[in-house]
């Protein structure tokens, strides 16, 4: 028998520095977790102790903090090289700055293979990108070889900006021939490494003949065997065992997100490359693990540019941006309108001639808007200003909901109106009318939504049984502020871009902004 140790990360999302337990900015260093310096300490410790070790990343290193905003992927290549990653799969967020924003900073600079078998380049891009990412890579490990085959969510065109010259194929259809090719090359130990979410990971384990292990990402899935060491609740045991269609046990793993854990999986193979057994657990990277001094020093050196960036002007406002709780928790506020407009603008994807866009709606809890911005400072807006408005380091995500769920959400928005509570919703692509004289749960008297399957966008009444795409904060997608119906009833959830980054990009693009209060939210009494 031959033993392999797989160390893995996924959905790190720009958390190069250590973070607090909830993966936001580190405040009390003695309680902080993760970060590449601490990760390196643990990886090196395992490399020294064990003979056959692979360090893999399942995508979405891009996007999530000011590190990505400023360095645009150069930081990912630099620190992943420093940690000596063995391979990475492309995630959807790797395309956030377009194909060029992937090729130049990452693909050309990475000293490790970057993989995806289901992304096919066409047209002029095919020659430009050729060899910069691969469908699979055969890695020597000790005296053996291990094949790593990559995959990426086929929803990427709806979630990011891969452009028109990349085709995202069905994962299973694309993986099988590549695995077959590895088998003909006498590679008998094969890891599928990819970024399509836990459900697809399990399907790959079940359906792709010859895959021995699946290392996944995208769904931020936390798996654990035994008593979990922090706040994350396990979605299942680690590894999660899938029975393949041919009757094998195929271990499937994921390691939550944000670099908080290092996935640790030990696989025992027989002489024919079949998995005999697998066991392990994610390792919580808490403060009991010291940060590596040389990596930490490098982080501090790179950090300097971030502090300078925070105070630079992104754009100007010529109106007061009312983000006060007195406004945003009671009525339509122009800061809410600005943020929602930025959220929709960030999700413009013309992927189908029948649709002007795939999503037109935004909802945003008023309680998530934490500060106004005064225009009487020469109109200047900085990252620092936006960090006061959106201090929680969240993301603006894409969900699919039934109309009936949206209706419940808007009823919840005003179920205890007048108490300055955070659940009052700001909106984009939605016209809502409330009648507060009616009893809670029955106060929404009109709810019109902007069409997507139209050449001239207009507002139509919400249909209860129709499925709608909506952009909203991850806080709401996870049921925050009492929006349990969203969490319980959502049909799909894809995590999006860092909230501040979305708004800062929009302001930079617009240069001068003047959001108004324009009748998106209205109140009526009696018949309207």
């Amino acid at each position: 028998a031959w033993e392999l140790t797989i160390l893995h990360t996924n959905d790190v999302h720009s958390r190069l520095e250590q973070t607090s337990e909830d993966s936001s900015k580190c405040v009390n260093a003695s309680r902080c977790m993760g970060g590449v310096a601490r990760l390196f300490t643990k990886v090196q410790q395992i490399r020294r102790a064990e003979p056959n070790v692979l360090l893999l990343d399942a995508g979405d290193q891009y996007q999530g903090t000011i590190w990505f905003t400023v360095y645009k992927g150069a930081e990912v290549a630099h620190f992943m090289n420093a940690l000596r990653y063995d391979a990475m799969a492309l995630g959807n967020h790797e395309f956030d700055n377009g194909v060029e924003g992937l090729i130049e900073p990452l693909l050309k600079e990475a000293k490790f293979p970057i993989l995806s078998a289901n992304i096919k380049a066409k047209g002029p891009l095919a020659s430009q990108i050729s060899g910069l990412y691969l469908p699979y890579k055969v890695l020597p490990v000790g005296d053996e070889v291990v094949g790593i085959v990559g995959y990426t969510s086929k929803e990427t065109p709806f979630l990011s900006n891969p452009g028109t010259n990349l085709v995202f194929e069905d994962e299973i259809t694309a993986l099988q021939p590549e695995v077959d090719k590895l088998k003909t090359l006498n590679v008998n130990k094969i890891i599928a490494l990819g970024h399509s979410g836990f459900e697809m990971d399990k399907l790959i384990a079940q359906k792709v003949r010859g895959v021995d292990v699946v290392v996944g990402g995208h769904s931020n899935t936390f798996l654990y065997t035994g008593n979990p060491p922090s706040k994350e609740v396990p979605a299942g045991k680690y590894p999660f065992i899938v029975t393949s269609d041919d009757g094998r046990k195929v271990p499937v793993v994921q390691a939550y997100a944000f670099g908080k854990y290092l996935g640790y999986l030990k696989i025992e193979f027989d002489e024919r490359g079949n998995v005999i057994s697998s066991h392990g657990n994610p390792i919580l990277l808490n403060s009991s693990i010291p940060e590596d001094p040389s990596i930490k020093a490098d982080i501090n050196k790179w950090r300097i540019k971030l502090d300078n960036y925070s105070t630079q002007e992104l754009g100007k406002t010529i109106v007061y941006l009312d983000g006060s709780s007195q406004s945003c928790r009671f009525r339509e506020c122009n800061m809410g309108n600005l943020i929602c407009d930025a959220m929709i603008n960030n999700n413009l994807r013309h992927t189908d001639e029948m649709f002007w866009n795939h999503v037109s709606m935004c909802i945003l809890n008023g309680g998530g808007i934490r500060s106004p911005i005064d225009e009487r400072n020469n109109g200047t807006i900085t990252w620092e200003n936006l960090a006061a408005v959106l201090p929680f380091g969240g993301t603006f995500d894409l969900v699919q909901l039934k109309g009936s769920t949206l209706k419940k959400a808007f009823e919840h928005s005003v179920h205890r109106y007048g108490q300055s509570t955070g659940e009052f919703l700001q909106v984009g692509g939605i016209h809502v009318v409330y009648d507060l004289s009616r009893k809670p749960g029955d106060r929404v008297v009109k709810l019109d939504v902007l069409c997507t399957k139209c050449r001239v966008p207009s507002y139509d009444p919400l249909k209860m049984d129709e499925v709608y795409k909506v952009i909203l904060p991850n806080f709401l997608a996870n049921g925050g502020d009492g929006f349990q119906m969203i969490k319980d009833e959502l049909l799909r959830h894809d995590s999006g871009d860092q909230d501040i980054n979305v708004v800062s990009t929009y302001i930079s693009k617009m240069k001068v902004i003047y959001p108004a209060v324009e009748g998106r939210i209205k109140f009526s009494t009696g018949s309207h």
Epitope: L203, Q206, K207, T243, D245, D246, G247, R248, K249, E268, D270, R272, N274, V275, I276, S277, S278
Partner: antibody
């Protein structure tokens, strides 16, 4: 080619135990679930349980917990099922099976 | 445990006829369903795995499909050797479970 060779017919007294074997060849014995099934004359199939020889993991249908015990010997690529406290309703043909290959079955007859 | 309800339990049909057997799953089993054939001498053969994939060597007249929680085995044109017993098996979660079986008889 893949073969599952089961042991011969068993005649046993009520209350006794029998040990059925299933010798596997032509594939990696440790890396596939081995299932055991029961079929009484003229009846349908019942799924008893399965063993994963690589790590010894076993799964049983509730009804057969305590009745059947599954083991595997990696060195001889043989799976075993012991049936204990035999009663007349245990008289049946027992099959070992992979997902795509089946043994020829072992007839167990329980009679006083 | 997941219940698999197989229907019909017996079926009389003629040579060349098209027939369908159905298994209904009590819970979601995805595509984790096999169809098995048992000869009169007790030997078993898997016809279809993963709901719709034909095993090698199985004639093309056999096909598998799914509609919601209903899984079907269709034989497009019956031949004499097809008049045997058929079972579905779900392997989505332990304990695996069989349908009650269908006896296909010649009219």
């Amino acid at each position: 080619q893949i073969q599952l060779q089961q042991s011969g017919a068993e005649l046993a007294r009520p209350g006794a135990s029998v040990n059925l074997s299933c010798k596997a060849s032509g594939y990696s014995f440790t890396s596939y679930w081995m299932q055991w099934l029961k079929q009484r004359p003229g009846q349908g199939l019942e799924w008893i349980g399965a063993i994963y020889p690589g790590d010894g993991d076993t799964r049983y249908t509730q009804k057969f917990k305590g009745k059947a015990t599954l083991t595997a010997d990696k060195s001889s690529s043989t799976a075993y099922m012991q049936l204990s406290s035999l009663a007349s309703e245990d008289s049946a043909v027992y099959y070992c099976a992979l997902f795509s290959y089946w043994g020829q079955g072992t007839l167990v007859t329980v009679s006083a | 445990d997941i219940q698999m309800t197989q229907s019909p339990s017996s079926l009389s049909a003629s040579l060349g006829e098209r027939v369908s057997l159905t298994c209904r799953a009590s819970q979601d089993i995805g595509s984790s369903l096999n169809w098995l054939q048992q000869e009169p001498d007790g030997t078993f053969k898997r016809l279809i795995y993963a709901t719709s994939t034909l095993d090698s060597g199985v004639p093309k007249r056999f096909s598998g499909s799914r509609s919601g929680s209903d899984y079907s085995l269709t034989i497009s044109s019956l031949e004499s050797e097809d008049f045997v017993d058929y079972y579905c098996l779900q392997y989505a979660s332990f304990p695996y479970t069989f349908g009650g079986g269908t006896k296909l008889e010649i009219k």
